[in-house]
């Protein structure tokens, strides 16, 4: 399995209810990535263990997060897999989707890169303690 997580994870709001998540393949020894797994959810849903899962093939390093709801903070993390198995998840990245009147024009929704974000548990199931 890949030894490290995808790097350079960024999440950016590109429409009022749609974000673009992008990333780069894991660092380290040459590893052929066959699939990426993207987990995302609002902070409240994440704490409750109600995440959404997207899969993207190994040549693709972008995905859309759609139907986001203004006023929520969304958490995103990504792992890479190959024929051996799944590697570790990236640090979590948060995106705050602001109400429309504050996200237009020159206002920019808060976006954190993975280097700035809190590190949460790498497991799919997260309990409440891991979010505090």
């Amino acid at each position: 399995a890949p030894a490290g997580p995808p790097v350079g994870v960024k999440v950016t709001l590109i429409e009022d209810d749609t974000a673009l998540v992008s990333w780069k393949p894991p660092d380290g020894p040459e590893t052929v990535v066959t699939r990426y797994t993207i987990l995302y959810a609002s902070r409240k849903a994440w704490i409750a263990g109600e995440w959404q899962v997207l899969h993207r093939e190994g040549a693709i390093t972008m995905a859309l997060l759609e139907n986001l709801v203004a006023g929520n903070v969304y958490i995103v993390k990504i792992s890479a897999s190959n024929e051996v198995g799944e590697g570790p998840f990236s640090n979590s990245v948060e995106l705050a989707v602001l109400p429309k009147e504050t996200s237009e024009s020159n206002q920019r929704p808060k976006r954190l890169d993975s280097a700035d974000a809190k590190v949460y548990s790498g497991y799919y199931h997260l309990d409440q303690k891991s979010m505090t």
Epitope: E57, M62, L64, E104
Partner: nanobody
Framework: EVQLVESGGGLVQPGGSLRLSCAAS????????MHWVRQAPGKGLEWVSS????????YYADSVKGRFTISRDNSKNTLYLQMNSLRAEDTAVYYC????????????????WGQGTMVTVSS
């Protein structure tokens, strides 16, 4: 079938300006969000900016914020990107695009129909 034709690219010195245009035909241009994306030589596609159907919501990538301005004229079915204070790292082919809404695991997020317009920033 959507047809998009980008124009306005060229060679410009660092600090210079260009205005890109994207003429659309064959679709209800005024009812869709539109995006500018770019691809630098040897690199992947990078999202640059977006504008809502009526122009009231606008977003920019951090790398261009404060330097680029997106706009549209629905009466002319045309999308624009005013690029100021250009830098060498802005060198790329620029495309106008729409988001592709498809959950296939092999899809890419943007539908790019045009040939793009090359912007080269060099002294």
């Amino acid at each position: 079938e959507v047809q998009l034709v980008e124009s306005g690219g060229g060679l410009v010195q660092p600090g210079g300006s260009l205005r890109l245009s994207c003429a659309a035909s064959g679709s209800a241009f005024g009812s869709h969000w539109m995006h500018w994306v770019r691809q630098a030589p040897g690199k992947g596609l990078e999202w640059v900016s977006s504008i809502s159907s009526g122009g009231s919501s606008i977003y920019y990538a951090d790398s261009v914020k404060g330097r680029f301005t997106i706009s549209r004229d629905n009466s002319k079915n045309t999308l624009y990107l005013q690029m100021n204070s250009l830098r060498a790292e802005d060198t790329a082919v620029y495309y106008c695009a729409r988001v592709r809404r498809d959950d296939d695991s092999n899809y890419r997020p943007f539908d790019v129909w045009g040939q793009g317009t090359m912007v080269t920033v060099s002294s």
